[in-house]
């Protein structure tokens, strides 16, 4: 048995007569033989679930669900209740109604076995019938909504009449009907005004019924019509077996460059017309098991269950359903030497499904793990300016397909043939497994005999120690020009274009900082700033070279404080800034301020 609503509302007035009927509560059956029996909780509750008093005023007819006043609620009784309401004005009280034989403790009131009945209290006597508006004669202030379980026997779930009105204003005629389309499973009995289902409902056909209740009031010669929504929600049960959309039960996958733990290798989708079990229970009740195969496969793969609610069209309306994605995921990083082909089977079980048929599916994954060989081009040719500053990025080296790699740890090293001309360094970028070449020793760069630099690039897979090699030829171009006096270590210090471009700074490939002119659109990613190279800084990402020294690109790498209009980067730097952003790396501070148009002369004059 279950209640068709979780809450009911009615009005209570001072000195309302004992015997006044208040409202009906309704229970629906889960099985045809069930007979409802209602009982009231012992206590009345007030604001914030405060237990006010034992309920001495309201009774229920156990078989019909009719609540009525057992004795009049007078002023003194109401005062007594109000005193216990933690100092709040007592505007509403509620009772708990339980369905026997459900033996719920009084403290808990959860649908489906318990409903709350709220009474709005009016510190006056019942108003004169002639003063009541049609809306007050027809419907409670709070609009009801109903919940009906699918596949359950039909039954009565609502009674339209406002019983106190009918009891105290017998001369006012009130008639009700339901506006509904053809063939809907609801009926309003003209005599009893009870609303019932005609047949068992199927949620997978229709989940929500937005009906309209029409009330016609006849008082003497006048007739008025009031209409309110009458929504019914159909509650789901696990009556649909899982299926494969379009019959696809097999997925094939190749594991090659993406070999990182947690990589999704393949996905198979399962459709279930149900939305139960609910999300909290779903993973426990909707199980997936990777069937035992060889030990290697069991250690290498796991299956992840990703359920998602979707909506499907049924009979012209949309109903919710569930799609379950089963992802075959790498459980560990795979060595580049690994080379296998296998078939994996996954058993999916909708354990709540009662039939007919089975709630079990078998998913198949065909997986090929291919080995990866390391290749570098035979030769790299690059040029570098003699004016380049330390940490200037001058190029990249990358084993074949390195951009596509994940879970493959390749380290790059440079071996110099000229001992005194070891100018460059290389660091491996975790993002794309490439090696970033940068200037490491500017003194060597300036030596006349270091006009051509010869290196061997060696790429090594850390797990297998497999290697690839290439020649690197670097031409040193231009002549060295000493820096202006007073130039900062970091390009980011400069706040104006003029002072930016006349200086170099750490990370500058040309020996000169570059000014990036922003778009001036409020707090923007494209803020004005001075950079060693606008190709790499700022780009919203503190790369592996920039991490070597905070002076290279504090705009991307600073962990300190940013003053002024900005949006902080994740996890560091400036994601967006207002106007011009300049930084003092040694002080771990950046400032984003409106564009500074003043003439440099003003500084000294106005100081």
């Amino acid at each position: 048995l279950y209640f068709s609503r979780d809450a009911y509302w009615e009005k209570l007035y001072v000195d309302q007569a004992a015997g006044t009927p208040l409202l009906y509560v309704h229970a629906l059956r889960d099985a045809p033989e069930e007979v409802p029996s209602f009982r009231l909780g012992q206590h009345l509750y007030g604001t914030y679930r405060t237990r006010l008093h034992e309920n001495n005023w309201i009774c229920i007819q156990e078989d019909t669900g009719l609540l009525y006043l057992n004795r009049s609620l007078d002023h003194s009784s109401w005062e007594k209740l109000s005193v216990r309401n933690r100092g709040f004005p007592l505007l509403t009280v509620y009772l708990k109604v339980f369905l026997s034989p459900t033996s719920l403790r009084e403290g808990e009131c959860q649908w489906p076995g318990c409903a709350r009945v709220y009474f709005s209290f009016f510190n006056t006597s019942f108003p004169a019938c002639s003063s009541l508006k049609p809306r007050e004669l027809c419907f409670p202030e709070t609009r009801p909504s109903f919940r009906i379980r699918e596949n359950r026997p039909p039954g009565t779930f609502h009674q339209f009449r406002l019983l106190p009105v009918q009891f105290l204003c017998p001369n006012i005629s009130v008639a009700y009907r339901l506006l509904e389309g053809e063939g809907l499973p609801f009926r309003c009995a003209p005599d009893s005004l009870e609303v019932s289902t005609r047949w068992a409902l199927d949620r997978e056909q229709r989940e929500k019924y937005e009906l309209v209740a029409v009330c016609t009031v006849h008082a003497g010669a006048r007739e008025e019509v009031v209409m309110v929504p009458f929504p019914v929600t159909v509650y789901d049960e696990d009556d649909s077996a899982p299926t494969f959309p379009a019959g696809v039960d097999t997925a094939s996958a190749v594991v090659e460059f993406k070999r990182k733990e947690d990589t999704v290798v393949a996905t198979l989708r399962v459709f279930d017309a149900d939305v139960v079990p609910a999300s909290g229970e779903l993973v426990r009740r909707y199980t997936s098991t990777l069937l035992p195969g060889d030990t290697w496969a069991q250690q290498t793969f796991r299956v992840e269950h990703w359920p998602n609610e979707t909506s499907v069209q049924a009979n012209g309306s949309f109903v919710r359903a569930t799609v379950h994605d089963y992802r075959l995921v790498l459980n560990r990083n795979l060595s580049i030497s690994e080379n296998r082909t296998m078939q994996l089977a996954v058993l999916v079980n909708d354990s709540d499904f009662q039939g007919p048929g089975a709630g079990v599916l078998l998913l198949h994954f065909n997986v090929s793990v291919l080995p990866v060989s390391l290749h570098l081009p035979s030769t790299y040719s690059l040029s570098v300016s003699r004016r380049a500053r330390r940490f200037a990025q001058i190029g990249k080296v990358c084993v074949e397909n390195c951009q596509a790699f994940s879970g493959i740890n390749v380290q790059y090293k440079l071996h110099s043939s000229g001992a005194n001309c070891s100018t460059l360094g290389v660091v491996t970028s975790a993002e794309d497994t490439s090696g970033i070449l940068f200037v490491n020793d500017t003194k060597a760069l300036r030596r006349p005999k270091c006009a051509e630099l010869h290196y061997m690039v060696v790429a090594t897979d850390q797990q297998t120690s497999r290697q690839a090699q290439a020649q690197l030829l670097v031409t040193v171009e231009g002549s060295y020009v000493a820096e202006e006096a007073g130039c900062p270590l970091s390009c980011a210090v400069s706040k104006r274009r003029l002072e930016c471009e006349e200086c170099g700074g750490l990370g500058s490939p040309t020996g000169r900082c570059e000014w990036r002119q922003g778009d001036g659109k409020g707090i923007t990613r494209n803020f004005s700033t001075c950079s060693p190279s606008t190709k790499t800084c700022p780009d919203g990402h503190c790369d592996v070279v920039e991490t070597q020294d905070i002076n290279i690109c504090p705009q991307d790498c600073l962990r300190g404080s940013i003053v002024g209009g900005h949006e902080p980067g994740e996890p560091r730097g400036i994601k967006a800034g207002y106007g011009t952003c300049n930084c003092f790396p040694e002080e771990e501070k950046c400032f984003c301020e409106p564009e500074d148009i003043q003439d440099p002369l003003c500084d000294e004059l106005c100081r």
Epitope: A485, P488, E499, R607
Partner: antibody
């Protein structure tokens, strides 16, 4: 040849203000490429950098957190000097105080120092 | 703040000895690192800046090495005027901090 000449009282009462001046010759307090620093030395704390002032389009000051709420370093372009003010002193501030020139942009090394002023905080 | 730890805190050596003093930073400071010499009653004097660059006028027997967190000052052949206290300093982030000093005494 750059020279830094310090001046100021050697005795200050607790809760009063310590004031020292550093006069520069052979360089300019407004020079773009350097910063002008105050450093102190005591047996308990060793060498402790206090703060600096420097000019680059605008004047900037940077102070050590340990004294930030009490310290002011001011340049005086007309006299080509800079000063230190340390408010609300306690006996803990007793030390040998130095001014020094810092090369702002090559990693801030201190290549010229004043002769030092021993300041005692005592009533 | 970045802590600078010097070792040893003092050492005894003879004229002509090769002496090495080490300094460790509590975090990576690249080469933003200097060495100073201080004699009693005098201000500190810059010896080495940027970890390994010799300040002009400083004898070539002084040399600096290291990068990151570990640094050394080496005096290849100790002279009588080298008996003094030596301080290391980081200038990577403010506040600039110094080591506690290493006193080089005559054996």
């Amino acid at each position: 040849q750059v020279q830094l000449q310090q001046s100021g009282p050697g005795l200050v009462k607790p809760s009063q203000t310590l004031s020292l001046t550093c006069a520069i010759s052979g360089d300019s307090v407004s020079s773009n490429s350097v910063a002008w620093n105050w450093i102190r030395q005591s047996p308990s704390r060793g060498l402790e950098w206090l703060g600096r002032t420097y000019y680059r389009s605008n004047w900037y000051n940077t102070y050590a957190v340990s004294v930030k709420s009490r310290i002011t370093i001011d340049p005086d372009t007309s006299k080509n000097q800079f000063s230190l003010q340390l408010n609300s002193v306690t006996p803990e501030d007793t030390a040998l105080y130095y001014c020094a020139r810092g090369h702002r942009y090559s990693g801030s090394y201190f290549d010229y120092w004043g002769q030092g002023t021993l300041v005692t905080v005592s009533s | 703040d970045i802590q600078m730890t010097q070792s040893p805190s003092s050492l005894s050596a003879s004229v002509g000895d090769r002496v090495t003093i080490t300094c460790r930073a509590s975090q990576n400071i690249n080469s933003y690192f200097n060495w100073y010499q201080q004699k009693p009653g005098k201000a500190p004097k810059l010896l080495i800046y940027a970890a390994s660059s010799l300040q002009s006028g400083v004898p070539s027997r002084f040399s600096g090495g290291g990068s990151g967190t570990d640094f050394t000052l080496t005096i290849s052949s100790l002279q009588p005027e080298d008996f003094a206290t030596y301080y290391c300093q980081q200038t990577y982030t403010i506040p600039w901090t110094f080591g506690q000093g290493t006193k080089v005494e005559i054996k």
